[in-house]
Interface confidence: medium
Amino acid sequence: FVRTKIDTTENLLNTEVHSSPAQRWSMQVPPEVSAEAGDAAVLPCTFTHPHRHYDGPLTAIWRAGEPYAGPQVFRCAAARGSELCQTALSLHGRFRLLGNPRRNDLSLRVERLALADDRRYFCRVEFAGDVHDRYESRHGVRLHVTAAPRIVNISVLPSPAHAFRALCTAEGEPPPALAWSGPALGNSLAAVRSPREGHGHLVTAELPALTHDGRYTCTAANSLGRSEASVYLFRFHGASGAST
């Protein structure tokens, strides 16, 4: 589930180059890696550089969101002549270098994936010592995290004129379709709100008017699975309250 594409200028996949005598700086990453929430995924990144036989100090860095300025999620440093890249930063302990930077490989493993990890990641290598040089992937690799639906909130809320409405919010990727069922409803898609800005995996469906007492069930479904949750509406007749 990685989609790689040919970069016609270099005949390499997502290869970014910087001209230089002899060998040149370039980085090879796939445009996208897909994995399911909970799994581990490998973000491949290999590079070439113009500094033949460089064995001085180096630092390998991965950042998220945007190149050059995005927050670092992983960083390690290797001393002169050492093949061991000592981890200095691994966000939440979930990032681990698999590649050997001395062999031009910065490939990273991300474990226990969550929907929040669905971002673009950028690899970077820095040389220090006799040679001072650095290079970073500009396009990066997009980590696409998929997940079966999970209902994160279901509730009944008061609305004007002593009526009640129900809200169901679910997350998943692809964003799940929501349906309500309940007394005198049959199966209803109700009013589904599009994923919210900044919350691309969340979908909310509203039942604007609950006209009958009983059990209301929200079902969320996508290609990876389905989930459901229920609320109960019981109004104290003759009073203006409700038990849910």
Partner: antibody, heavy 123, light 107 residues
């Protein structure tokens, strides 16, 4: 020397759960991961899942909804469960060692394989 | 998913012949390619990883080459013990995928 041995029932009924165990020797599951791969009779190889040395998992998404993998490092065993089987799941099932995780450059190759066990799904 | 297409699906050659098997990936795999040998009734055996690196103990008549999407396994001088089915496998992306196999026989 490095060895992997698959075991489990040779016959499973449709809709039931297939359970297989891979017992390893000559290396530690603390340092190496294990893949499961299957091969229907007369056909090619299909990768199922990898459990890394630290217990993390990477699944083939086409099978993930039916697959469970776990390991018991102290017993040198990795187990595979495949639920809701059909005749299409009839195959030789192999476990294979995943080389040491760090710095190997061999993220997903399989350097030693078990001999495989044939599982037939039939009523 | 990255599809791996092997050709030919089968071949027959004489002892001592040079044999070439090709594997084409549907996308670039950056040389993250392995070759396996599977003899009848046996498990696969890793021959080559990284497109070109011969595993320890594998005879030097086996070699791998290629880059980008096109890769080749060559047996420089076919021996009777090389009768087997050969599979390529990419590991640039998950799910890991194998070629359909090439069955090699002796004439």
């Amino acid at each position: 020397q490095v060895q992997l041995q698959e075991s489990g029932p040779g016959l499973v009924k449709p809709s039931e759960t297939l359970s297989l165990t891979c017992t390893v020797s000559g290396f530690s599951l603390s340092n190496y991961g294990v893949h499961w791969v299957r091969q229907p009779p007369g056909k090619g190889l299909e990768w199922i899942v990898l459990i890394w040395s630290d217990g993390s998992t990477t699944y083939n998404s086409a099978l993930k909804s039916r697959v469970t993998i776990s390991k018991d490092t102290s017993k040198n065993q990795v187990s595979l469960k495949l639920s809701s089987v059909t005749a299409a799941d009839t195959a030789v099932y192999y476990c294979a060692r995943h080389p040491y995780d760090d710095y190997s450059g061999y993220y997903y190759t399989m350097d030693y394989w078990g001999q495989g066990t044939l599982v037939t799904v039939s009523s | 998913d990255i599809q791996m297409t092997q050709s030919p699906s089968s071949l027959s050659a004489s002892v001592g012949d040079r044999v070439t098997i090709t594997c084409k990936a549907s996308d670039h795999i950056n040389n993250w390619l392995a070759w396996y040998q599977q003899k009848p009734g046996k498990a696969p055996k890793l021959l080559i990883s990284g497109a070109t690196s011969l595993e320890t103990g594998v005879p030097s008549r086996f070699s791998g080459s290629g880059s980008g999407t096109d890769y080749t396994l060559t047996i420089s001088s076919l021996q009777p013990e090389d009768v087997a089915t050969y599979y390529c496998q990419q590991y640039w992306s998950s799910p890991l995928t194998f070629g359909g196999g090439t069955k090699v026989e002796i004439k």
